[in-house]
Amino acid sequence: PPNRRTCVFFEAPGVRGSTKTLGELLDTGTELPRAIRCLYSRCCFGIWNLTQDRAQVEMQGCRDSDEPGCESLHCDPSPRAHPSPGSTLFTCSCGTDFCNANYSHLPPPGSPGTPGSQGPQAAPGESIWMAL
């Protein structure tokens, strides 16, 4: 690889723990997404909280190591936890620059492989860009 991995960096107010130490923040100014250059991996992650039909970004940044899923070119989130009734946390890992900025769709909030109501969808060929 010619370059160190660069990911979108975001932490919602009130999230516990920070992944800021897993990279070096780039000085991007105010109107652009914050960017972080990963120190220990070539892998980005994103966490979204799906409540009813609204997805909110919780965290974006660098992973601490390269693990399964990091070879993915795009952010394809899978449901991970139910922090409160009616809400589901979706996470993705991916291994291209800024791949954690967006997702093409969210799978059903039920556990992987089980049917459930569909999350907010992008139109075919589109991506949902998270407003940071």
Partner: antibody, heavy 113, light 112 residues
Framework: QVQLVQSGAEVVKPGASVKMSCKAS????????VSWVKQSPGQGLEWIGE????????NFNEKFKGKATLTVDKSTSTAYMELRRLRSDDTAVFYC??????WGQGVLVTVSS | DVVMTQSPLSLPVTLGQPASISCRSS???????????LEWFQQRPGQSPRRLIY???NRFSGVPDRFSGSGSGTDFTLKISRVEAEDVGVYYC?????????FGQGTKLEIK
Amino acid sequence: QVQLVQSGAEVVKPGASVKMSCKASGYTFTDYWVSWVKQSPGQGLEWIGEIYPKNGVSNFNEKFKGKATLTVDKSTSTAYMELRRLRSDDTAVFYCTRQRDYWGQGVLVTVSS
Amino acid sequence: DVVMTQSPLSLPVTLGQPASISCRSSQSLEYGDGYTYLEWFQQRPGQSPRRLIYGVSNRFSGVPDRFSGSGSGTDFTLKISRVEAEDVGVYYCFQATHDPNTFGQGTKLEIK
């Protein structure tokens, strides 16, 4: 095939600005960083900075902050570098490069009164 | 800034003979992700630089296999197994591990 075609040579006066272009073709412009490199006459190479066309995020050599501004036009797959407050020691060839694997032909900027 | 020091600065070589260029960095170029972001470029007279090697030892597409790169940490080498006339030019090492990225001062290869 991947190509980076840069604008023509410029002769400018001290204190002026210059904006050069780098038109990319043969690949998905938004998927690769575009870097800029300076080569002063008879000298080596100096990394100026880089920009990611998809979102406009840039990363600079501290030495060139305030001197260089990097922008892109995604609709024409073109990267731009503007140099401000030019001095005689800014006389150089400036290259654009796609993550250093493919390079433009260079733009000679001559600063002279 | 990380200083990249090349030697020799001038390298006269007989056609068909091997050539070797050394590059030493002032800090280790092994990054926390396990990769070493060290590259080699060739600049022929009047031309733009051309990437030869990335990641210490990976040849870029279209680069003849007479070019090879090796090394680790702070010491790196570019070798040309048999020099050809078209190899004349200046060779630069480059690091992208630390900001700002930096080039070596260049080694001028000429035919004896």
